[in-house]
Each structure stands twice: as C-alpha cells, then as structure tokens.
C-alpha cells in the first residue's frame, strides 16, 4: 500500500508522489533507499524533492531504484516507498506492457479516456493524443482538459492510446507521454 510503482521514459519528465500522504502542513523528506542519502530540494538539480513530490527533470535510466519518503507531523513520522523504473525509449511504435497504465472501458454513452498521471504535472493545453502511434484526427476525437472524448464509439476504437503533453518547470519544458489501453463494451 505504501510502496508505489512508478515508471517513465528516459529524457522525459517524471514526477512521483509520496504514497504516504499527510496534511498540507506536514514536511516530507526524500531519500535514496539504497544509500539513505537525502535528495536535494534545490530546483537546479536534475532530480529534486518538492514537498510530497519527487521530480526527475528529465529522467535517466540510472535513476531507477527505490526512494523513501518520510512524512513528518509534529508527533508522527510515517514512511512511504516509491519504486521507480526508467526505461529506454522504444525505437518502434510498440508500447510494451510494462509501460502501460490501467485499461479503461468505454461505451457509446461514455467514452472518456483520462491521461494517466497528468494531475501531477504543470501542463497547459493542448494535450496531444495518439492511437497505436498515429496522431488522432477527425471530428470524432475531442481533447478536453485532461481526457479524450470519442464520439460514436465503435469496436474499432479499441486500442492503445497515448497522451503527450509538456511539463513546465521554471521556464523549462519537458515532454511526458503515457499510454493506456481502451476497450469497447456493449451497452
């Protein structure tokens, strides 16, 4: 429960939230679990801690490992673990299973596909969407806030959908992509 798997691609931004949440006033310290070395909070570092978030801007394969977060209230200290894996970018279109977020189901009445993890990032529209690596075009597809709406859903709409957006941190831009499967169910 308090160990969370997170993954990303090299040279993209990855932001990980401490799985142990506390009240906003509580402080959060982050450590490399293997060395118990504190992770810096200064934003000039490529990897730095920002309250309950650990930011990899951008991520590198060597960042993979387990990170410890300790949330401190005036009287209690509670520990969480973030298991981070950074993968090399695939040269082909195929998205391996280990990079996929949870599958979502849709129907003619409800066809929203949320972009996974986007709430952790400082992003601005537009959000780009791809299906099986092809940019989505046509009036049936509407990118709305952090999700994609498909009008008049058909069984052929099933597949892997990737959202792509830009995270901005102190004026610097970093790309983020996330992929999940979409299945179509009968009403």
């Amino acid at each position: 429960k308090f160990s969370k798997q997170s993954w990303g691609l090299e040279n993209e931004a990855l932001i990980v939230r401490c799985p142990r949440q506390g009240k906003p006033s509580y402080t959060v310290d982050w450590y490399y679990s293997q060395t118990n070395k504190s992770i810096p909070t200064q934003e000039r570092n490529r990897v730095f801690a920002s309250r309950d978030r650990l930011k990899f801007l951008p991520a590198a394969v060597a960042d993979s490992g387990i990170y410890t977060c300790i949330v401190r209230s005036p009287t209690f200290n509670r520990t969480g673990y973030a298991n981070v894996t950074i993968y090399k970018k695939q040269s082909d279109c195929n998205v391996p299973d280990y990079l996929m977020y949870s599958t979502v189901s849709g129907s003619e009445k409800n066809s929203k596909i949320y972009c996974p993890t986007i709430d952790l990032y400082n992003w601005t529209a537009p959000l780009e969407w791809f299906k099986n690596c092809q940019a989505l075009q046509g009036s049936r597809y509407r990118a709305h806030k952090s999700f994609l709406v498909i009008d008049n859903v058909m069984t052929e709409d099933a597949g892997d959908y990737t959202c792509k957006f830009i995270h901005n941190e102190n004026g610097a831009n970093y790309s983020v992509t996330a992929t999940r499967s979409f299945t179509v169910k009968d009403e």
Epitope: K1, F2, Q21, G22, K23, S73, T75, F76, R78, T79
Partner: antibody
Framework: EVQLLESGGGLVQPGGSLRLSCAAS????????MIWVRQAPGKGLEWVSS????????YYADSVKGRFTISRDNSKNTLYLQMNSLRAEDTAVYYC????????????????WGQGTLVTVSS | EIVLTQSPATLSLSPGERATLSCRAS??????LAWYQQKPGQAPRLLIY???NRATGIPARFSGSGSGTDFTLTISSLEPEDFAVYYC?????????FGQGTKVEIK
C-alpha cells in the same frame, strides 16, 4: 495541552435517545478527524463512528447505522453523538478520540482520548 | 470487516520478564496496525503505530513488529506499571476494528 471531555451520558430506557458531547481544546479542532469508540462493561473496544475534519464525511459501525448520528460544530470545538432507538447492548462507556493524521479516504490511530462517559440502557 | 485475533487472552508474568503479545488479522492490513495499553478506569493509551513505530513518550522497552497479517508487541522487561490490557487496532479500512485484548497480569 490537548484535552477531550465527554458529557451527556446517563441512564436511559430502551428505545430512548441521548446526545453525547465532546468538548475539545488545545488543538485546531476543525482540521482533525474525530471518532467515537465505546467499551461495554468488562469488554473490549468497539469503534462506533468517525467524522472527517472540515469536509465532514461520516462513517458508522453496522451496529449503530441508522440509529446514531455523528456531527461536529467546529466553531464550538465540539463533537456530538446523537443516539436514538437505544438498546440494552448499547450500554457502554463512550470515548471520543482524535485521529491525528487522516487524509481523505484514509484512517489512522487515535492519539488522544477523553475520559469517557457512561451510557446505561435499562428499563 | 477485518477481524483481529489476539493471543493469548491472558499472560501471567513477573516484573522484569519479557512479554510477547500476538495479533493476527483476517486479511492483510499492510502496516496499518496500532497497539494500545489500557489500565482499569482509564482511557486507552497509544503505544505503537504503523506496526513498529513508538508513539511520542513511549519507553523503548515497548516494540512492535510484523506486517500483513501477523503482528507482535514485545515488552522487553516488564515494569510494575506495564500490567494492563493491550489492544491491537487496524486502520487500513473502515470499519476500524480492535482485537479482543490481551491482559498482562502479575504472576
């Protein structure tokens, strides 16, 4: 210093009603989840009900659902438990306690407890 | 609901001895388990949270261990004031549940 002081207990007939109060002091009451726990004579502890801080979401044990109502008045730093349709098996010492951590959707331990108020349901 | 079973029901020991109390959950509670001490006529007092962390002001002779379904509270050397009833509690999900208690009495 954190203090919780229950009141309102007493003898009541089966089917009757009672309202317990818990006056809190020494901490910012509104941001903490609050809980009622009871203990029947010579028995163990039983969670009765919880209420979130400012959000006010409520949770009940099956044994009291539909009969008991937990509420709070953050302006008065007071927690309440309205008990209706009381039964003999509701006889217990009722404690109010503080959850010092909870975030939405989670629970934690009880770090401060009141001294308890005895509710006796008998004819 | 998650049922917590404590054993033994009663533990008869002398001051200075080691006490080992067990709490078993009917399903995994990860480390969302606490231990409380209760003396006659008093409210419970928090000893251990998150299975193994001592609450503020609790002496080092109290320690907790375990995760998942099996947990242990150990009192390394009993002091006269440690004779009391001890309860475990899970808080992974509502309803919050307590064990039935273990009474540590003087032999």
């Amino acid at each position: 210093e954190v203090q919780l002081l229950e009141s309102g207990g007493g003898l009541v007939q089966p089917g009757g009603s009672l309202r317990l109060s818990c006056a809190a002091s020494g901490f910012t009451f509104s941001i903490y989840d609050m809980i009622w726990v009871r203990q029947a004579p010579g028995k163990g502890l039983e969670w009765v009900s919880s209420i979130r801080g400012e959000g006010g979401g409520t949770y009940y044990a099956d044994s009291v659902k539909g009969r008991f109502t937990i509420s709070r008045d953050n302006s008065k730093n007071t927690l309440y438990l309205q008990m209706n349709s009381l039964r003999a098996e509701d006889t217990a010492v009722y404690y109010c306690a503080r959850d010092p951590w909870s975030t939405e959707g989670s629970f934690f331990v009880l770090d401060y407890w009141g001294q308890g108020t005895l509710v006796t349901v008998s004819s | 609901e998650i049922v917590l079973t404590q054993s033994p029901a009663t533990l008869s020991l002398s001051p200075g001895e080691r006490a080992t109390l067990s709490c078993r959950a009917s399903q995994s509670v990860d480390d969302d388990l606490a231990w409380y001490q209760q003396k006659p006529g008093q409210a419970p007092r928090l000893l251990i949270y998150d299975a193994s962390n001592r609450a503020t002001g609790i002496p080092a002779r109290f320690s907790g261990s375990g995760s998942g379904t099996d947990f242990t509270l150990t009192i390394s050397s009993l002091e006269p004031e440690d004779f009391a009833v001890y309860y475990c509690q899970q808080y992974i999900t509502a309803p919050l549940t307590f064990g039935q208690g273990t009474k540590v009495e003087i032999k």
